[in-house]
């Protein structure tokens, strides 16, 4: 059974993941329309369902393409460091949260970068609210 300290740790990690995803989404939405409309041609893969922590495997698998698209959009822009830091944070947090159980992602949908970040933000929020109630 999970201890109160491990539950608290999970909660903190989810809070951190949520924050980093929100930072990335804000960065994307802050781009001038010319950049954003170009970013929206890129595809990101979403699984059939995201309801459990093990499903974070599917987020992990899309982190490299996500970083590449954000780097392309930034070019020589000074926000590059923020993106790298957020992606790195997400990587570390996801590894902690998803556990060691191997999970095979079944992707059934392709979405834009904005939809992708919003879906994972919603996932974090729903897990946080479920675990705190």
């Amino acid at each position: 059974a999970p201890t109160s300290s491990s539950t608290k740790e999970t909660q903190e990690q989810l809070d951190q993941l949520l924050l980093d995803l929100q930072v990335l989404l804000k960065g994307v939405n802050d781009y001038k329309n010319s950049k954003l409309s170009r970013m929206l041609t890129f595809k990101f893969y979403m699984p059939k369902k995201v309801t459990e922590l093990k499903h974070l495997q599917c987020l992990e698998e899309e982190l490299k393409p996500l970083e590449e698209v954000l780097n392309l959009a930034q070019g020589k822009n000074s926000h590059g460091g923020n993106t790298r830091e957020s992606i790195s944070n997400i990587n570390v947090t996801v590894l902690k949260l998803k556990g060691s159980e191997t999970f095979m992602c079944e992707y059934d949908e392709t979405v834009t970068i904005v939809e992708f970040l919003n879906r994972w933000i919603t996932f974090c929020q729903s897990i946080i609210s479920a675990s705190s109630s």
Partner: antibody, heavy 117, light 109 residues
């Protein structure tokens, strides 16, 4: 109604210059890319390049880089495509189209350019 | 430079299903778009983001994607669907747009 209206057909001689236009209406012209597409007689569509009217940021297909110039005057919601020196091989229909997150969703009626001596 | 490959022509009888494919190396990561062009007319968007249909486009038009290939499917083809169809996407950097060579759909009979 959202629309793009292009300038009329042109007949030119080789070596002459030309500037054709594409006027947008019914939407915020500044904040959508305008693409230019060539269609030579009996052939397919070829992407030439795009311009973002708000800041005149441009992208050209490698095939058209240096051959044509795109520009825009956001004060009159108009994009332009121009040639410094036309060739017979520039004879084609030229379309402008609005690029949104859902692709080239609005197209102009096309401008036929004929280059012949 | 980046290319999208389509079959030059597809023929189908009225009421049958027509499938037009488009292949390109960047398609696993770039959305594809489909346009219909009838003689003497400007192209019209029929499918965007691989599978989405703009309002006003009949339900018989649908799109799908698998790996490096996207497919435009027209179910229950009608005579008015006879046209050229072009796929369009971007290169892997999202910088350059490109059109496929086009597919002429002929409705037999």
């Amino acid at each position: 109604e959202v629309q793009l209206v292009q300038s009329g057909a042109e007949v030119k001689k080789p070596g002459e210059s030309l500037k054709i236009s594409c006027k947008g209406s019914g939407y915020n012209f500044d904040t959508y890319w305008i693409g230019w597409v060539r269609q030579m007689p009996g052939r397919g569509l070829e992407w030439m390049g795009t311009i973002y009217p708000a800041d005149s940021d441009t992208r050209y297909s490698p095939s058209f880089q240096g051959q044509v110039t795109t520009s825009a005057d956001k004060s009159i919601s108009t994009a332009y495509l121009q040639w410094g020196s036309l060739r017979a091989s520039d004879t084609a229909m030229y379309y402008c189209a609005r690029f949104s997150s859902s692709a080239y969703d609005i197209w102009g009626q096309g401008t036929m350019v004929t280059v012949s001596s | 430079s980046y290319e999208l490959t389509q079959p030059p022509s597809v023929s189908v009888s009225p009421g049958q299903t027509a499938r037009i494919t488009c292949s390109g190396d960047a398609l696993p990561r770039q959305f594809a778009y489909w346009y219909q062009q009838k003689p003497g007319q400007a192209p019209v968007l029929v499918i965007y983001k691989d599978t989405e249909r703009p309002s006003g486009i009949p339900e018989r038009f649908s799109g799908s994607s698998s790996g490096t290939t996207v497919t435009l499917t027209i179910s229950g083809v009608q005579a008015e669907d006879e046209a050229d169809y072009y796929c369009q996407s971007a290169d892997s950097s999202g910088t350059y747009h490109v059109f496929g060579g086009g597919t002429q759909l002929t409705v037999l009979g």
